[in-house]
Interface confidence: low
Amino acid sequence: LPAQVAFTPYAPEPGGTCRLREYYDQTAQMCCSKCPPGQHAKVFCTKTSDTVCDSCEDSTYTQLWNWVPECLSCGSRCSSDQVETQACTREQNRICTCRPGWYCALSKQEGCRLCAQLRKCRPGFGVARPGTETSDVVCKPCAPGTFSNTTSSTDICRPHQICHVVAIPGNASMDAVCTSTSPTRSMAPGAVHLPQPVSTRSQHTQPTPAPSTAPGTSFLLPVGPSPPAEGSTGD
């Protein structure tokens, strides 16, 4: 004969367990039904009656099968530097993530608690490590033969153009100015060039990226101009 199906509430076998989506009620000493996501336990079970579930109210949720006495409050509305990537529903909490140009300086279980603006590398500095959802941009000084003339959170140090005849030598924040009508641009930092008469340095080796600051610390630093080693605008 097939085993008899037990309907909740029922007493578990000694040392046995309740089934999936059931819990053991300590007072009733019975296996009772959990409530599905989007609901909560309005009335706990007894020896003779099962759990009574009710829908979550507006702005509250339960994400799991549960037996909680009230639904959880959805998180507060997303701040101006955030985007709501998941709305608050009866079955899920609101999730806020940082908008473009910002990163999460203080994360929470889902989404972000505090966003901070990505560091901008000032002229003479380029991006050594781009920003991610959870880490800030790392800036580095432009190596000899490279420059950056922008204040940007995305621009890297670019190689100087290579002049046959140089009018103004390039530096870390300015490209070389050529008198020749047809300047050439080196392919990339570290590119090998065929021997040719050039007036500027063509040593374009890529420096080692500077060590990253701990993610989520920059927003705590005092506002003001950054020391040159940081290569940050300080905004």
Partner: antibody, heavy 123, light 112 residues
Amino acid sequence: EVQLVESGGGLVQPGGSLRLSCAASGFSFTNNYYMCWVRQAPGKGLEWVGCIYPSIVGPTYYANWAKGRFTISRDNSKNTLYLQMNSLRAEDTAVYYCVRDRYDDYGDYFNLWGQGTLVTVSS
Amino acid sequence: DIQMTQSPSSLSASVGDRVTITCQASQSIYNYLSWYQQKPGKAPKRLIYYASTLASGVPSRFSGSGSGTDFTLTISSLQPEDFATYYCQSNSGVNGNRYGNAFGGGTKVEIK
């Protein structure tokens, strides 16, 4: 770093009141977590005081001996848990621990403890 | 409130010994039981939950068993860092919080 830091302990006279605070950091305090208080008298065992449900309005659950004199509350905007203790007695002298618990059945019971704050009730 | 009775209250043992601590609940708590280790001046550390599930980072020499009212914590081979006080605790989840999260009286494991 995920941590709980208690404060507000100290010397208080019998019959007096004291409010303990527990500042939570490194995790989402607002949702998912029951927050509880456990105490330990000098040289004695652990004693459960009570817990509060994740939302601001409760509900709260207390050990029988704590009902009426002790009140647990939380300020989710400050990520802080409180224990208001009234009509204090000498036997309430203990280290009071703030503890994190889960609202669901992930088995994440009492898995994060603060360092404790000492309350001494004496005249 | 549920009462948790732990025994023995203290024991002396040597490194390498097998140690067993028992805990009895005043009513059935199914498998909603945790074990903690506490060292002097420190907060307790959770070792086991759901009666037999080892918490993250806890050495496998610790094990738990039992269901209903009778539970056991076993240390298969006692190590120097295991000399401490051990507590059991009833914790039956949200619904169970209405009936308390009672601790046992503790078992102090000392060096023989």
